[in-house]
């Protein structure tokens, strides 16, 4: 969480950003809020990116003003125009690319004053893992699969019964490059599993951490997956029995945006 204050002139306003991560090939959200103003026409929002000459986005007098927009962002950005009046300056970014990573500045001008805050935006690929019993295997085996990750993550297995145990000797992990030659499919197999135990497959890179749990008993199989963006207040949970999902702004695009 970064809170910035305006420093020029007598008046300053508080601007708040949240470091977040973008999933390449999907929508991203750059989160920014500010002290609201009662008049939309008095609000100016400027998004800038370190190392980019043109603007990422500008919104003023109640509408987008894109004459100074850098070409790399053309047709890829929008603010939530109906939420600007309540202090939401967050930016929607289309088709996140690896090159979108960097330091962004959310700069706000209102009738109350000026303010800005920086935001670190990471880009990569991350996805929910799914753990299943591998019935094709000769012994009791679990298979953990996640379709899209980048950079290459680490995979660690854990179990509720054997806490602290090292499963590296009885597991095998492979990374298969996807057709677009950037992201990779993660497949990890755990051998010699026992019944009435909960196993967790944990996948992590510097952007996200995801866990897939499976509990196998005589009568049923329960699954649960969890994805958390690192350095960001966002997480998503899915269970095969009970599905719960929630999001703060940084994860919103993976849930509901076009």
């Amino acid at each position: 969480l970064i809170i910035g204050f305006g420093i020029s002139g007598r008046h300053s306003i508080t601007v708040t950003t949240v470091a977040s991560a973008g999933n390449i090939g999907e929508d991203g959200i750059l989160s920014c809020t500010f002290e609201p103003d009662i008049k939309l026409s008095d609000i100016v929002i400027q998004w800038l990116k370190e190392g980019v000459i043109g603007l990422v986005h500008e919104f003023k007098e109640g509408k987008d003003e894109l004459s100074e927009q850098d070409e790399m962002f053309r047709g890829r950005t929008a603010v939530f125009a109906d939420q600007v009046i309540v202090g939401n300056a967050s930016l929607r970014l289309k088709n996140v690319q690896l090159t979108d990573a960097g330091t962004y500045k959310c700069y706000i001008i209102t009738s109350k004053g000026k303010g800005n805050a920086n935001l670190e935006y990471k880009t990569g690929a991350f996805s929910m893992p799914e753990v299943n019993v591998d019935y094709n295997a000769s012994s009791e085996t679990l298979r953990c699969e996640a379709p899209r990750w980048f950079p290459q993550p680490t995979v660690v297995w854990a179990s509720q019964v054997d806490q602290g145990a090292n499963f590296s000797e009885v597991s095998n992990t492979s990374f298969e490059l996807n057709s677009e030659n950037v992201t990779m499919k993660v497949v990890s197999v755990l051998y010699n599993v026992t019944i009435n135990n909960t196993y967790s497959c944990m996948i992590e890179n510097d952007i996200a951490k995801a866990t897939g749990d499976i509990k196998v008993t005589e009568s049923e199989i329960k699954r649960r997956s969890h994805l958390q963006l690192l350095n960001s207040k966002a997480s998503l949970c899915v269970s095969s029995f009970l599905a719960i999902s929630w999001a703060l702004l940084p994860l919103a695009p993976y849930l509901m945006l076009k």
Epitope: G25, E26, D27, H57, K63, D64, E65, L66, S67, Q69, R74, G75, R76, T77, A78, A81, R92, K94, N95, N178, S179, E180, V182, T183, L257, K258
Partner: antibody, heavy 121, light 107 residues
Framework: EVQLVQSGAEVKKPGASVKVSCKAS????????IGWVRQAPGQGLEWIGD????????NYNEKFKGRVTITRDTSTSTAYLELSSLRSEDTAVYYC??????????????WGQGTLVTVSS | DIQMTQSPSSLSASVGDRVTITCKAS??????VAWYQQKPGKAPKLLIY???TLQPGVPSRFSGSGSGRDYTLTISSLQPEDFATYYC?????????FGQGTKVEIK
């Protein structure tokens, strides 16, 4: 309600040019991209290009580059498609469509009624 | 340029059937695939965008799925008004591209 009303049918000779108009209403014209798509008789949809009326920025299908020009008149909330050096294979229904997502180029969510352009000697 | 290869080009089905239409992108990967329905003499109608999001007012029997380069439109139980031509659209890149279309006819 978003409405896109296109100009009437045109008959042109090979080598000539045609200019089709698309008048928008029911939303802020300068805030949404407008695209153009054509459909030859019995054929599929073909994307031609689009324009952001707020700044006049355009994108074109490589196939039409040099022959197509997309413009707009913000005072009348109208977008235009001009196609030059017409040939018989340009005979098609030409559609304009609003792109969803405001300054973000989204999918085409509202369409005009179409304009039939016939190229015949 | 990205090409969208749509299949099949046509299919015959009966009311109540489950129908699946696929589109494959020639390269790249993103979730920006939309599906349209078009009836003769009419403009296309947006059904689904961002791979799987249903456009307001579109019946829930229509659904979309996919990732990477492969995308699918499914009609769970075909209704008489669903006989039409369907197109996919890739809109993630600078240049948009439609699939060739799939005509769904009455068996």
């Amino acid at each position: 309600e978003v409405q896109l009303v296109q100009s009437g049918a045109e008959v042109k000779k090979p080598g000539a040019s045609v200019k089709v108009s698309c008048k928008a209403s029911g939303y802020t014209f300068t805030s949404y991209w407008i695209g153009w798509v054509r459909q030859a008789p019995g054929q599929g949809l073909e994307w031609i290009g689009d324009i952001y009326p707020g700044g006049g920025y355009t994108n074109y299908n490589e196939k039409f580059k040099g022959r197509v020009t997309i413009t707009r008149d913000t005072s009348t909330s109208t977008a235009y498609l001009e196609l030059s050096s017409l040939r018989s294979e340009d005979t098609a229904v030409y559609y304009c469509a609003r792109l969803d997502g405001s300054s973000y180029r989204g999918a085409m969510d509202s369409w005009g009624q179409g304009t039939l352009v016939t190229v015949s000697s | 340029d990205i090409q969208m290869t749509q299949s099949p080009s046509s299919l015959s089905a009966s009311v109540g059937d489950r129908v699946t239409i696929t589109c494959k992108a020639s390269q790249g990967f993103n979730k920006y695939v939309a599906w349209y329905q078009q009836k003769p003499g009419k403009a296309p109608k947006l059904l689904i965008y961002y791979t799987s999001t249903l456009q307001p007012g579109v019946p829930s029997r229509f659904s979309g799925s996919g990732s990477g380069r492969d995308y699918t439109l499914t009609i769970s139980s075909l209704q008489p008004e669903d006989f039409a031509t369907y197109y996919c659209l890739q809109y993630g890149n600078l240049l948009y591209a439609f699939g060739q279309g799939t005509k769904v006819e009455i068996k």
